[in-house]
Amino acid sequence: EPCVEVVPNITYQCMELNFYKIPDNLPFSTKNLDLSFNPLRHLGSYSFFSFPELQVLDLSRCEIQTIEDGAYQSLSHLSTLILTGNPIQSLALGAFSGLSSLQKLVAVETNLASLENFPIGHLKTLKELNVAHNLIQSFKLPEYFSNLTNLEHLDLSSNKIQSIYCTDLRVLHQMPLLNLSLDLSLNPMNFIQPGAFKEIRLHKLTLRNNFDSLNVMKTCIQGLAGLEVHRLVLGEFRNEGNLEKFDKSALEGLCNLTIEEFRLAYLDYYLDDIIDLFNCLTNVSSFSLVSVTIERVKDFSYNFGWQHLELVNCKFGQFPTLKLKSLKRLTFTSNKGGNAFSEVDLPSLEFLDLSRNGLSFKGCCSQSDFGTTSLKYLDLSFNGVITMSSNFLGLEQLEHLDFQHSNLKQMSEFSVFLSLRNLIYLDISHTHTRVAFNGIFNGLSSLEVLKMAGNSFQENFLPDIFTELRNLTFLDLSQCQLEQLSPTAFNSLSSLQVLNMSHNNFFSLDTFPYKCLNSLQVLDYSLNHIMTSKKQELQHFPSSLAFLNLTQNDFACTCEHQSFLQWIKDQRQLLVEVERMECATPSDKQGMPVLSLNITCQMNK
Amino acid sequence: QKQYWVCNSSDASISYTYCDKMQYPISINVNPCIELKRSKGLLHIFYIPRRDLKQLYFNLYITVNTMNLPKRKEVICRGSDDDYSFCRALKGETVNTTISFSFKGIKFSKGKYKCVVEAISGSPEEMLFCLEFVILHQPNSN
């Protein structure tokens, strides 16, 4: 069975084809090759000599037991080598020779028992080494690591490392890898020698499900003293053994680390005293809790020095009390409990993501809701009912505003966005908005992107609501049940490049409303009910137009519409997916491609 | 279509079939077997995925006695610092995991429950596997 040609001459997918040897019928130009799940078993010297351009090679689960010297010799362009799930028993010293451009080596679940005799010391270009799910017992980083000066990611998770000693990291003292991210999760750790991490600098350290008791956790974290780490991730996994007890003493040792960003990821334990628990983390710049349950929500009003707070997938009794002077970014997403938003006091806040919480807002939105006048980014998407009761007074700095899939109330009662002259991006898609007021978008003089799909208009008619949006480049009006539009609806949109009118209820096409759209490149009218043209004579669309989508409409392929069908043929160079432009009537022509019709009408007269 | 039996409990019988062409082997055990009136137990899965499990989600299509419920999407792996350790599993890596579950206080009517589980993962998204579970529910007289 042949390999699947994914990208001709470049990418080949040969997965699970029962190959016992490497295929030699693929082009020399192959750059990406997936040979996974084939019983190759043995890689001899120069096994891939016929793939001189290869960049990515996937050998996952190929039952490989032996890799000989120079197996990959000649692959000087190879950047990624994946060996996951091979029961390697014999790895020659020169197994990886010739891989002068290798950046990523994945040797997960390969029976690797030690880093010491893993022959990769010459791979100077290596950026990522993943040796997770192996049998490694010692965390001693061999001397050859001093050659791996580009290493950025080392994944040692799910191994058998129990202890870390001062000597294990000696090589890092000799050549500080300023950018190294280290994952030690799921190693059964019980001892870290104090001083082992002294004056070590890491970009990221991840320790999840490493400790089987609170005491072990406490002493191991104390053993991290002296570490300078940009991002520290602690926590557990839901499907692994969890700590029976967790209290403030667990994290006391963090006072002896220098941490820029901290994250606690999943804890099967109720956190009741955040102030004491995170006492050593008051001055990290970014603080993040993922999948934890928080009892006392008032604690977030303590004077933490965080600039970025992230609360994701957590459980709260009620919406937390947030009073944080220095906070610039707040991400509060996919949380449960506390369904009603309550005011926060965050005077420095510039970025606020409150999406996917099922929150309801009694009144939105003004400076008093968020306690800031600096807000530039606000995401309230995928929430509950949001009642618009103020038009963003004090929030004039906003540049990005997203309400999609929330239920907006009182949108047509006043000019909701009047203050937002700096707004560039607005998404009110699927917000149950019924446009009944022409001044709905007044004030949005800088707006470039407007997404309002899945809403509705009074009498299914699009009025002149865009008159002030002179900078608009993208407009989505799909799924709005529109049947008609004002001939001057788009007259002021001279910068508009993309207009999506798909999935509406238009029965005829008219070029007149688009005459002023001098920058229009894409016009999508798919999934309407277009049968014919509105006027007998259709003019041309703007000369800038490059893509016109008229697919899945109800074209009437009869003589009375001959001029319209001819006009469509004349637009052939603009049309996309022409094979999906089919006749709907008459019944004898149903399903026929519109462009293949020979429109001579004498026969039917 | 071969049917794979999972387990029987006092009020339910659970089995599954594959609803995809690939039919890559997957081993599923539930201990103790699910009782629909209330249940607490462990789900054990042994599986070798054909793609990375990063950004894994399930599309669930549930049918109750021939009545179709709306499609439901359950995100399991968001993509970074996920709740489950198997979210970091790579294509070809053995996934051998036990997940605890519990639910109570749901009253189910007697009959045949079908649940098609489409597992989607990776970037670009592709189907990982598709299983159709059948639960025959015989409520006790109480």
Epitope: D24, N25, S47 | -
Partner: nanobody, 112 residues
């Protein structure tokens, strides 16, 4: 036991030609992808010519139009015709059987 014996190397002036031969014993080459690989001191090794069983060939840009690989399955031999040689073509040239290995190599030195 499979053996590959290269010959034909030597010292030449820039612009001259050489023809390398590789005689294989212990295995039939008719079903094997064959090629030549060169290693210059202090430089990254590179494939200079590959020939498949159907006769299709590959050359990197650095030798394209100057080098030509051919095979004689009856004689179990592979050849590399090198024309318009340049100083940067200097190195040890190894005959390769994909998946099996290489010979001892033959030295090619091109002087200016």
């Amino acid at each position: 036991e499979v053996q590959l014996v290269e010959s034909g190397g030597g010292l030449v002036q820039a612009g001259e030609s050489l023809r390398l031969s590789c005689v294989v014993s212990g295995i039939s080459i008719s079903t094997k992808v064959m090629g030549w690989y060169r290693q210059a001191p202090g430089k990254q090794g590179e494939s200079v010519a590959i020939i498949k069983t159907d006769g299709s060939t590959y050359y990197p840009d650095s030798v394209k139009g100057r080098f030509a690989i051919s095979r004689d399955n009856a004689k179990n031999t592979v050849y590399l015709q090198m024309n318009s040689l340049k100083v940067e073509d200097t190195g040890v040239y190894y005959c390769i059987i994909t998946g099996w290995g290489r010979g001892q190599g033959t030295q090619v030195t091109v002087s200016s």
